[in-house]
């Protein structure tokens, strides 16, 4: 549906509040270093312009594309060259190349200060003094640190953020009310950002077909009663939404997401019986709820898959007629029967099936050739099952912190060239799979664990892509999206790695560690553990465990000492010497 003015169209569809919020997110995700005030100024200028177009769609420049309008606006920033260096060269390009150029310069790990949470009273005063600015600042700070955050979902987070302050700043104990809510929003926000980053990586690095395959599998698990044609329609629409958001087209994305939610709710009966509650909610909550909705019950008496996909004499004929449709149907049928499988496993099975048909449909006796294709699935299914069983066993034995440490050692040995902060961050997140998924019964463990691991390993991939240091990481990240986790799992110790020189400063600790939060203290100890493995990659787990136990005792002892700093200095030297002897450093 062509509109004379795209900007007027989106302003009317979304309303002024959402329009302004989405433009702010878009600008902050592109120009991540710009001050808040500069972005607000740009957003206000764009909004005023949009209003003139609403009043008269034929007014000057109103017929320009959003990319042209937004790009022109971003290119007016005076300090572009000083602040962003070569990104300023984007402004010499024409659309669509200019937008592609901006997208390529999005930074997954921007050099920004950590967000420090002020005192509750300070936050409440700021909230009451200027609610609008306070909430805009939230959008800005999240968007610039998470340049692929799913914009319409960020509006939902902002709504909850506002609700938390509205409620808690009036409470008797403001802190007790507010802090747990903010912690929850922070943790959920990080998870949401990482999940969306995988969707964007899937689209940008592996293409639309890869994303659509993922969507077919996931939606078929979620809506097993829906017909294939219905699932296909939802997949097409969902792909459009995420392509837009990942491409920086946030107004179109939010608009299309609202349309998709509307469609799903109008067609609940042919989609899922679990949507009723979601569809009674306001728009932002509704969209979020649909995205998180539990899997519907599988239809009773689904026939065996073998009839249509192995035993039928028309398999090759059906495949040849429309390859992707036939593979899509296979994936749909397999996924709706297997909510107990991870999406990535389902995609591996579909790939195996596709490879077999490619080979067998060209053979003398195709049926004889593909008759045993389902037997090839067994080892593919058992591999993640075994891995999850083993790691949950270790998690239950160790608890989260020590389980993270085991993963830190494991991944540092596999890819020791990766920076220590990245190894710590990724391994800590990998370790959270234990608390998140091991509590589930068998039928829910694999989809929980393996699909979560895909999200975390994508973090490693995008961080590594910015500064590539390991051919093994590059290989696992780029060869196959669905085989990333098995690729990393299969890595043994990197025999080519030259151990890092010993540096006493790396293992020198001070009394300030005693005042850190438990989480920060863990990160300090885990940083030391990674450095230890980088110095001594051949150290056994028993050796490392002994050193870490001694280290924990040392920190505990010195934090209880009267003269903490002296204790850290003297006992620290002894600990380093003992560790060197134990590990033969």
């Amino acid at each position: 549906d062509a509109h004379k003015s795209e900007v007027a169209h989106r302003f009317k569809d979304l309303g002024e509040e959402n329009f302004k919020a989405l433009v702010l997110i878009a600008f902050a995700q592109y120009l991540q270093q710009c001050p808040f005030e500069d972005h607000v100024k740009l957003v206000n200028e764009v909004t005023e312009f949009a209003k003139t177009c609403v009043a008269d769609e034929s007014a000057e420049n109103c017929d320009k594309s959003l990319h042209t309008l937004f790009g022109d606006k971003l290119c007016t920033v005076a300090t572009l060259r000083e602040t962003y260096g070569e990104m300023a060269d984007c402004c010499a390009k024409q659309e669509p190349e200019r937008n592609e150029c901006f997208l390529q310069h999005k930074d997954d790990n921007p050099n920004l200060p950590r967000l420090v949470r002020p005192e509750v009273d300070v936050m409440c005063t700021a909230f009451h003094d200027n609610e609008e600015t306070f909430l805009k600042k939230y959008l800005y700070e999240i968007a610039r640190r998470h340049p692929y955050f799913y914009a319409p979902e960020l509006l939902f987070f902002a709504k909850r953020y506002k609700a938390a302050f509205t409620e808690c700043c009036q409470a008797a104990d403001k802190a007790a009310c507010l802090l747990p809510k903010l912690d929850e929003l922070r943790d959920e926000g990080k998870a949401s950002s990482a999940k969306q980053r995988l969707k964007c990586a899937s689209l940008q690095k592996f293409g639309e077909r890869a994303f659509k395959a993922w969507a077919v599998a996931r939606l078929s698990q979620r809506f097993p009663k829906a017909e294939f044609a219905e699932v296909s329609k939802l997949v097409t629409d969902l792909t459009k939404v995420h392509t837009e958001c990942c491409h920086g087209d946030l107004l179109e994305c939010a608009d299309d997401r609202a349309d998709l939610a509307k469609y799903i709710c109008e067609n609940q009966d042919s989609i899922s019986s679990k949507l009723k509650e979601c569809c009674e909610k306001p728009l932002l909550e509704k969209s979020h709820c649909i995205a998180e909705v539990e899997n519907d019950e599988m239809p009773a008496d689904l026939p065996s898959l073998a009839a249509d996909f192995v035993e039928s004499k028309d398999v090759c004929k059906n495949y040849a007629e429309a390859k992707d449709v036939f593979l899509g149907m296979f994936l749909y049928e397999y996924a709706r029967r297997h909510p107990d499988y991870s999406v990535v496993l389902l995609l591996r099975l579909a790939k195996t099936y596709e490879t077999t048909l490619e080979k067998c449909c060209a053979a003398a006796d195709p049926h004889e050739c593909y008759a045993k294709v389902f037997d090839e699935f067994k080892p593919l299914v058992e591999e993640p099952q075994n891995l999850i069983k083993q790691n949950c066993e270790l998690f239950e034995q160790l608890g989260e912190y020590k389980f993270q440490n085991a993963l830190l050692v494991r991944y540092t040995k596999k890819v020791p060239q990766v920076s220590t902060p990245t190894l710590v961050e990724v391994s800590r997140n990998l370790g959270k799979v234990g608390s998140k998924c091991c509590k589930h019964p068998e039928a829910k463990r694999m989809p929980c664990a393996e699909d979560y691991l895909s999200v975390v390993l994508n973090q490693l991939c995008v961080l590594h892509e910015k500064t590539p240091v390991s051919d093994r990481v590059t290989k696992c990240c780029t060869e196959s999206l669905v085989n990333r986790r098995p690729c990393f799992s299969a890595l043994e110790v990197d025999e080519t790695y030259v151990p890092k020189e010993f540096n006493a400063e790396t293992f020198t600790f001070h009394a300030d560690i005693c005042t850190l939060s438990e989480k920060e203290r863990q990160i300090k100890k885990q940083t030391a553990l990674v450095e230890l493995v980088k110095h001594k990659p051949k150290a056994t787990k028993e050796q490392l465990k002994a050193v870490m136990d001694d280290f924990a005792a040392f920190v505990e002892k010195c934090c209880k000492a009267d003269d903490k700093e002296t204790c850290f200095a003297e006992e620290g030297k002894k600990l380093v010497a003992a560790s060197q002897a134990a590990l033969g450093l």
Partner: nanobody, 124 residues
Framework: QVQLVESGGGLVQPGGSLRLSCAAS????????MGWFRQPPGKEREFVAS????????YYADSVKGRFTISRDDAKNMGYLQMSSLKPEDTAVYYC?????????????????WGRGTQVTVSS
Amino acid sequence: QVQLVESGGGLVQPGGSLRLSCAASGRIFSTYAMGWFRQPPGKEREFVASINRSGDSTYYADSVKGRFTISRDDAKNMGYLQMSSLKPEDTAVYYCAADSDGIGWFNSFEYDYWGRGTQVTVSS
């Protein structure tokens, strides 16, 4: 420390059987998982089978599933690998290894202690 010594290797015809043993001494063997790895001539070391510390979970490489059986006898501080329907591609040096987590991982670097290996040759 745990010391591991493998035995039972030798020359066998295709289709034949062998039983490898792994004798452990030193620390309490029952707290460790046990694994068998092999290194075929001119190739990397590869996982064959493992058994966790309690003996209730066993894992096998796809290439040996249904032909090899891993077991342990903690009273004797022994581990075993029963190999049947042997093929020429099973020819390798077989190593026994102990894992302090007690899990029985697939990756060799997860194992703290290793034996020196025993040669298995399958040939007619």
